[in-house]
């Protein structure tokens, strides 16, 4: 799996999308987990509804929400009020039994100020609202890591 980079602005909301084959993953719950080190486990942050039929319902854990379009085959994760400590490596997963298939590897980068980062596209940043439903989602900048880029810093 290549790693896709999603950039968001500190204090704003970042939306991460993970496309998947809806037929292959039919009937499976999904999860968003945080990678703990290069060889470490992926720690579950939030997962979709326990009843797969209700996967479209938004599930939350703290400032992170997840929803699944099982027909369209897109898992969407919203990180609200993005903070520097949210930066890091994550995975979108498809669950079956005690096993998990990786749908996408994600690197979340947190930008301090969009005006200082011309590569972020001079985004206009709306004010943060109080709830996920009303949150203005910052259009994320995403790219895949180039071949040879190291997703984790080498350990000494």
């Amino acid at each position: 799996h290549n790693t896709t980079v999603f950039q968001g602005v500190e204090g704003q909301s970042l939306q991460v999308s993970c496309p998947y084959d809806s037929m292959k993953h039919w009937g499976r719950r999904k999860a968003w987990c945080r990678q703990l080190g290069e060889k470490g486990p992926c720690q579950r942050v939030v997962s979709t509804h326990n009843l797969w039929l209700l996967s479209f319902l938004r599930r939350r854990n703290g400032s992170t929400a997840i929803t699944d379009d099982t027909l369209g085959g897109t898992l969407t994760i919203t990180l609200r009020n993005l903070q520097p400590h949210d930066a890091g490596f994550y995975q979108c997963q498809s669950l079956h039994g005690s096993e998990a298939d990786t749908l996408r590897k994600v690197l979340v980068e947190v930008l301090a100020d969009p005006l200082d980062h011309r590569d972020a596209g001079d985004l206009w940043v709306p004010g943060e609202s109080e709830s996920f439903e009303d949150a203005h989602v910052e259009h994320s900048i995403s790219r895949s890591l180039l071949e040879g880029e190291i997703p984790f810093p080498p350990t000494s």
Partner: antibody, heavy 118, light 107 residues
């Protein structure tokens, strides 16, 4: 503002069928679940089944399996609940409820009283 | 199916008092539990979802807690409009089930 408006009260004979409608206004109808819940006089709430209009997928409580059919018409943003082989114990207020974003019963219709009497 | 048992069946309190309602599940429902309020002749109204999250427009005096099999709905200071029947509901597993209800009445 999402609203659910149900059809009017019905009086039915034992053995017949009843079809109750639930029209949604506001919001996107297809993407959410519509459930049906009933409440017999002086009793608690009983879940009957749910439909996802987007896919037409439905799930029914085993107690009502074979007797209840839940359908949805996306063109009119209306869901229907048909209950057949009616008996006196089916006398109840029938509610439709839909998901908004967070849980399955976010928004409720006003209820439809169905009386089964000979 | 998962059975939800609510207690007490009736709670007699005065306005301004604290109400504590219990809901116990026959097996773990994780945090997939909601609370509803119903007044005579009206449809139920969602108060709490995911065990502890207040629904939009619900006053802060309503709070939910618990996880697994034991859940509590607390009304910190009863207002006259809070006297009603309260139901818990799980959607952890099919079929979706409701508790039998707790009636909060004026003492």
């Amino acid at each position: 503002q999402v609203q659910l408006v149900q059809s009017g009260a019905e009086v039915k004979k034992p053995g017949s069928s009843v079809k109750v409608s639930c029209k949604a206004s506001g919001g996107t109808f297809a993407q959410y679940a519509i459930s049906w819940v009933r409440q017999a006089p002086g009793q608690g709430l009983e879940w009957m089944g749910v439909i996802i209009p987007d896919s037409g997928t439905a799930n029914y409580a085993q107690k009502f399996q074979g007797r209840v059919t839940i359908t949805a018409d996306e063109s009119t943003s209306t869901a229907y609940m048909e209950l057949s082989s009616l008996r006196s114990e089916d006398t109840a207020v029938y509610y439709c409820a839909r998901t908004q974003e967070n849980t399955i019963f976010d928004i409720w219709g006003q209820g439809t009283m169905v009386t089964v009497s000979s | 199916e998962i059975v939800l048992t609510q207690s007490p069946a009736t709670l007699s309190l005065s306005p301004g008092e604290r109400a504590t309602l219990s809901c116990r599940a026959s097996q773990s429902v994780s945090s997939y539990l909601a609370w509803f309020q119903q007044k005579p002749g009206q449809a139920p109204r969602l108060l709490i979802y995911d065990a502890s999250n207040r629904a939009t427009g619900i006053p802060a005096r309503f709070s939910g807690s618990g996880s697994g099999t034991d859940f509590t709905l607390t009304i910190s200071s009863l207002e006259p409009e809070d006297f009603a029947v309260y139901y818990c509901q799980q959607d952890y597993e099919w079929p979706i089930t409701f508790g039998g209800g707790t009636k909060v009445e004026i003492k």
